[in-house]
Interface confidence: low
């Protein structure tokens, strides 16, 4: 079941999935001046069995000016540029979830892919939030959001995170100004059972990851 919308916005924060649930789709988008090959896939799909998950389909981009030249799917090491990442406030990171059953890793880049990746999430997906550079986190609870099924509809839980500028006066619960809050999407829905189709993903933090998980742009 696809989630009916995207994870909620937290001002001055980004979100990232550590791993993607089976059923997740990733658009095959190409950067300006390139297009998908005519017989190419519209999207990659995370599929698998009980022991292994992987991305079906391959994204392939070709020059818009070229007729039949198919660009290779996986860049050679010397061609694979580093991705820009957002500086983290601390080295604390969610644990690596790529080995979780029923989840796919972040797909490797394909040649001439677009600068931003467009995912279509499914129920049970969890994303993690972190303040962008220049802002610090005021935690009131988990800085994550989970897509859940409620009353036959999907919704994302509200992450308990406020990002405040280093020089700003600290904001406290009740003082922050909601930004683009969706109407009619209360977090406390106690009138019926809230379920997820996934086991609760670990939320312990690991302090030894070398790079930021919050990729903001793909070069």
């Amino acid at each position: 079941e696809l989630c009916d919308d995207d994870p909620p916005e937290i001002p001055h924060a980004t979100f990232k999935a550590m791993a993607y649930k089976e059923g997740t789709m990733l658009n095959c988008e190409c950067k300006r001046g390139f297009r998908r090959i005519k017989s190419g896939s519209l999207y990659m799909l995370c599929t698998g069995n009980s022991s292994h998950s992987s991305w079906d389909n391959q994204c392939q981009c070709t020059s818009s000016a070229t007729r039949n030249t198919t660009k290779q799917v996986t860049p050679q090491p010397e061609e694979q540029k580093e991705r820009k990442t957002t500086e983290m406030q601390s080295p604390m990171q969610p644990v690596d979830q790529a080995s979780l059953p029923g989840h796919c890793r972040e797909p490797p880049p394909w040649e001439n892919e677009a600068t931003e990746r467009i995912y279509h999430f499914v129920v049970g997906q969890m994303v993690y939030y972190q303040c962008v550079q220049g802002y610090r986190a005021l935690h009131r609870g988990p800085a994550e959001s989970v897509c859940k099924m409620t009353h036959g509809k999907t919704r994302w839980t509200q992450p308990q995170l406020i990002c405040t500028g280093e020089m700003e006066t600290s904001q406290f619960p009740g003082e922050e100004k909601p930004q683009a809050s969706p109407e009619g999407r209360p977090e406390s829905e106690t009138s019926c059972l809230v379920t997820t189709t996934d086991f609760q993903i670990q939320t312990e933090m690991a302090a030894t990851m070398e790079t930021s998980i919050f990729t903001t742009e793909y070069q």
Epitope: L2, C3, D4, D5, D6, P7, P8, E9, T14, F15, K16, M25, N27, E29, R36, L42, Y43, E116, R117, I118, Y119, H120, A180, S181, P182, R185, F214, T215, T216, E217
Partner: nanobody, 130 residues
Framework: QVQLVESGGGLAQAGASLRLSCAAS?????????MAWFRQAPGKERDFVGS????????SYADSVKGRFTISRDNAKSTVYLQMNNTKPEDTAVYYC??????????????????????WGQGTQVTVSS
Amino acid sequence: QVQLVESGGGLAQAGASLRLSCAASGRTLYSSYGMAWFRQAPGKERDFVGSISRYGTYTSYADSVKGRFTISRDNAKSTVYLQMNNTKPEDTAVYYCAAYTYSGSFYSTVKTHRDEYQYWGQGTQVTVSS
């Protein structure tokens, strides 16, 4: 990546209703795009009317149309709609459909600025007479 074509414009009496449609085409997943309607009256700036998120959960409206206009979308038909009720002469304008690509790392539930939209239709004329 996506082409937009508006339809449904025309002449209407004040107080009447109109329904504009915007059909998207292109070899892409329509649900990858947030959609919006803008309008431009003669000699004026192109103004935000309303927006809708890629699955239709979030909507936003300009104060001038709140309670009168409703934006909706049908992803199966790759179409976004603008239902205009209780029209007024000041609603006279060329109405444009616009789309933006959702980004997997950043998300905003409401986009109201025209420079946030990468794709535009050619527009459809709406004239409301008193």
